[in-house]
Interface confidence: low
């Protein structure tokens, strides 16, 4: 359904909301609902000399049989319900008298409902409605062993492991306005550390003293350790309980879910199920080895008469998980949208490497010291997300397969700059199977951790520009973080991009960074890459951007926990065949991040190969004319000269595999 429109008469006053219904929007974001009306009997004009407009506009929200009037507008004046004073506005009225578009700021869960745009003109009346569903939930997440053990990178990964992403300040603010409170400092997506407090008390004053609100410690060094606030958006599948008279150990619970065609649910999935109304007064195992239960109907014997996802702890200070051999129900998840967690993940490195969520009980609040110590002990496991490499290491060294001579006919394209104005250089290169005039590659000069001849040296890893799909500038801030994580990297910081720039990195593509700014490094300024620095070299910035805007992303990879190897055969591989070939060799298709990390270790191949995201790339350490130009870097093959478009999955190429 698109919209509901009603009108008393044909060919009379008509109102429309040209927007599909229901409209699903993220917690904490803003919403614009377009509403236009046509009044044939009283044509409107925008000339300043006309008399005031007579039509009356009314916006209301209908939920659970109750209508709340948000605002009323007539004769160019807008009266807003005082409860929504800072919340709703008509951005285009009265400048465009027939445009009743509504803007709603900082969406909260309770902003869900049916929005009605009603226009009255004399005795005529017409309206249109749109259902709005605010989706998502913010939850606090804590390391299993003790409080404040997550640095910024691990905080992001912890959320991702729990079917969530790190929350934005806007999402935490919206959750706070919805009633969320937590006296625990946690990372947010903009690299700030905050916590929401409704009832200020000793130990929880933060920077706001006795006033309610979200406390902030500002932008923190990424090595400092705190908890994290995660945001779970939605799930396609279903959370359900599995039980038996004798209950399950953790391993038995995992096996039981698998027997039922499912897997243990993550904390984020349980939160979404709770938000949808799940209520179970029985604790169950989750994928991160935590034990929790969702309470939607408060009762004294189920979580202390409080609502929420309750957590079972071993210690009175709300740390430590139950022993894996203790017995609880199993909370399972079935659906396609799960994030894989390796079978042995939680057995590696001891308890300090496991992250969990905490619920703060009212009679046992942990005080938050005003001076937080930096650098608490941290675990060393690097969390990764799909694809996860659950392979047993092969005792055999991977053989270097034979390669082919360059195919005659590969076309080199002169330097171009695409329509959007900021482009890198595509190069023809010798890779069989692309055919003449189809290979467009981009030069991603990157900076690496290990010394490659003739290349600048950046301690600590590789910064690279990433465009995961076929089109340019397609990633929101949240999607950008996930894209880097999916490729075995993390979103880069401004400092990392600056260091890469200083070491010679240039890329004329705007990309997200972890502080929610959008930047790109330019060593040799040219017309479409001027940005905010005119003719001076430097990292260009668009500053902090709304998280819903779309750009590319700059990722950072600091180590390779395994080995990337080049694979080929006479007929080469389609994308599916490449996946299967790598798997048949106890490996997986490498991610872009893994290829960058391998390139930084010296991997040099003048043949493009499939990667896990369906892209086609090749690493060049020693530049030569036939291999992607005059600079080292990882080259990307595009379909189109403006450097967009992924290769056809049925086309045949080599492959890069990864063995962990």
């Amino acid at each position: 359904a698109v919209t509901v429109e009603t009108s008393d008469h044909d060919n009379s006053l008509s109102v429309s909301i040209p927007q599909p219904s229901p409209l699903r929007v993220l917690l904490g974001t803003s919403l614009t609902i377009p509403c236009y009306f046509i009044d044939p009997m009283h044509p409107v004009t925008t000339a300043p000399s006309t008399a005031p407009l007579a039509p009356r506009i009314k916006w209301s929200r209908v939920s659970k049989e109750k209508e709340v009037v948000l605002l009323v507008a007539t004769e160019g004046r807008v009266r807003v319900n005082s409860a929504y004073q800072d919340k709703v506005s008509l951005p285009n009225y009265p400048a465009i008298p027939s445009d009743a578009t509504l803007e709603v700021q900082s969406l909260r869960s309770n902003d869900s409902g049916v929005y009605r745009c009603e226009v009255m003109h004399g005795i005529e009346d017409s309206e249109a409605t749109l259902e709005v569903v605010v989706k998502g939930i913010v939850f606090h997440y804590r390391a299993i062993s003790t409080r404040y053990t997550l640095d910024f990178d691990r905080a992001q990964r912890a959320c991702l492991q729990n079917s969530a992403i790190i929350a934005t300040p806007e999402q935490l603010q919206a959750a706070y306005e919805d009633g969320f409170h937590q006296c625990d400092a946690g990372w947010l997506a903009d690299q700030t550390v905050r916590y929401p407090i409704h009832t200020p008390r000793e130990g929880c004053y933060g920077d706001k003293d006795e006033f309610p609100g979200v406390r902030t410690y500002g932008i923190r060094d990424t090595n400092e350790t705190y908890d994290v606030y995660c945001f779970a958006e939605e799930m396609e599948g279903e959370v359900f309980y599995a039980t038996s008279p004798e209950k399950f150990t953790f391993q038995e619970a995992a096996n039981e879910c698998r027997r039922l065609g499912a897997r243990l649910a993550t904390t984020g999935q349980l939160y979404l199920a709770w938000q949808a109304g799940m209520d179970m007064c029985s604790a169950g195992w989750l994928a991160d080895r935590s034990v929790r239960y969702p309470i939607s109907k408060a009762r004294p014997n189920c979580g202390g008469n409080l609502l929420g996802v309750r957590t079972v702890y071993v210690h009175a200070n709300q740390t430590g998980y139950p022993d894996p051999s203790s017995r609880y129900d199993a909370i399972c998840y079935t659906g396609e949208d799960f994030v894989d967690i390796p079978e042995n993940f939680f057995g590696v490195g001891g308890e300090e490497d496991i992250t969990v969520q905490t619920v703060t009980w009212p009679d046992m609040e942990l005080p938050l010291p005003r001076n937080i110590t930096e650098g608490e002990a941290r675990g060393s496991v690097i969390l990764t997300v799909k694809p996860i490499f659950e392979v047993s290491p092969s005792p055999l060294e991977p053989e270097e397969p034979f390669t082919f001579a360059p195919e005659i006919g590969a076309t080199a394209f002169a330097e171009v700059e695409n329509e959007t104005g900021e482009a890198t250089r595509p190069w023809g290169f010798p890779t069989p199977g692309l055919g003449p005039a189809t290979a467009f590659t981009s030069e991603d000069l990157v900076v690496q951790v290990t010394a490659v001849p003739g290349q600048p040296h950046l301690p600590g890893g590789v910064v690279f520009h990433y465009r995961p799909g076929p089109t340019r500038y397609s990633l929101t801030f949240e999607e950008a973080q996930q894209a880097c994580l999916r490729t075995g990297a993390v979103i880069a910081s401004p400092e990392q991009l600056q260091a890469a720039y200083e070491a010679g990195y240039e890329q004329c593509d705007a990309g997200w960074l972890r502080d929610q700014t959008v930047r790109y490094p330019i060593v040799s300024p040219r017309t479409p890459c001027v940005g905010d620095k005119d003719s001076s070299p430097g990292v260009r910035t668009y500053g902090v951007r709304p998280s819903t805007e779309t750009y590319d992303v700059y990722c950072f990879v600091d180590r390779l926990e395994g080995e990337v190897f080049f694979a080929t055969r006479l007929e080469q591989f389609t994308f599916q065949e490449a996946l299967e070939f790598c798997e048949s060799h106890n490996a997986t298709l490498a991610t872009t991040g893994q290829l960058y990390a391998a390139w930084s270790r010296g991997l040099d191949k003048c043949y493009a190969g499939w990667l896990a995201d369906g892209s086609l790339r090749y690493p060049i350490v020693t530049p030569r004319p036939a291999c992607g130009g005059d600079k080292p870097g990882v080259r990307t093959v595009y379909l189109y000269p403006n450097q967009t478009g992924l290769p056809d999955p049925l086309s045949r190429h080599h492959a890069f595999c990864f063995r962990g």
């Epitope: 004073q85 800072d86 506005s89 905010d532 910035t541 500053g543 902090v544 951007r545 709304p546």
Partner: nanobody, 125 residues
Framework: QLQLVESGGGSGQPGGSLRLSCAAS????????VGWFRQAPGKEREGIAC????????TYVDTVKGRFTISRDNAKRTVDLSLDSLKPEDTAVYYC??????????????????WGRGTQVTVSL
């Protein structure tokens, strides 16, 4: 209602001074870069001055450099533009506008999201 309101316009003499103020209603200015623009009759709207979120970075168009000064007071939700050494060619409708919280500030109108309704400045003998 979220809006910007300009005030302080009026008539001035060549060589004289005026002080324009831009007030935010319904939202905090401290997340936004703020720009001042002007539009003379029959001419395009031009960016003349802007201030970054922190106020640390300011930009001026060449024609007003050294004569106009932009300043901000986030606590009061205002951004002021002081117009000194006025010239007849400064006659225009002056608008303030905000763009998302960027740390440098542009003078291009297309970068700005929310606009005030303007205040008239007339410079004549």
């Amino acid at each position: 209602q979220l809006q910007l309101v300009e005030s302080g316009g009026g008539s001035g003499q060549p060589g004289g001074s005026l002080r324009l103020s831009c007030a935010a209603s319904g939202f905090d200015l401290d997340y936004y870069a703020v720009g001042w623009f002007r539009q003379a009759p029959g001419k395009e709207r031009e960016g003349i001055a802007c201030t970054s979120v922190s106020g640390a970075n300011t930009t001026y168009v060449d024609t007003v450099k050294g004569r106009f000064t932009i300043s901000r007071d986030n606590a009061k939700r205002t951004v002021d533009l002081s117009l000194d050494s006025l010239k007849p060619e400064d006659t225009a409708v002056y608008y303030c506008a905000t763009t998302w919280g960027i740390h440098w500030c542009p003078l291009s109108a297309s970068e700005y999201r929310r606009w005030g309704r303007g205040t008239q400045v007339t410079v004549s003998l």
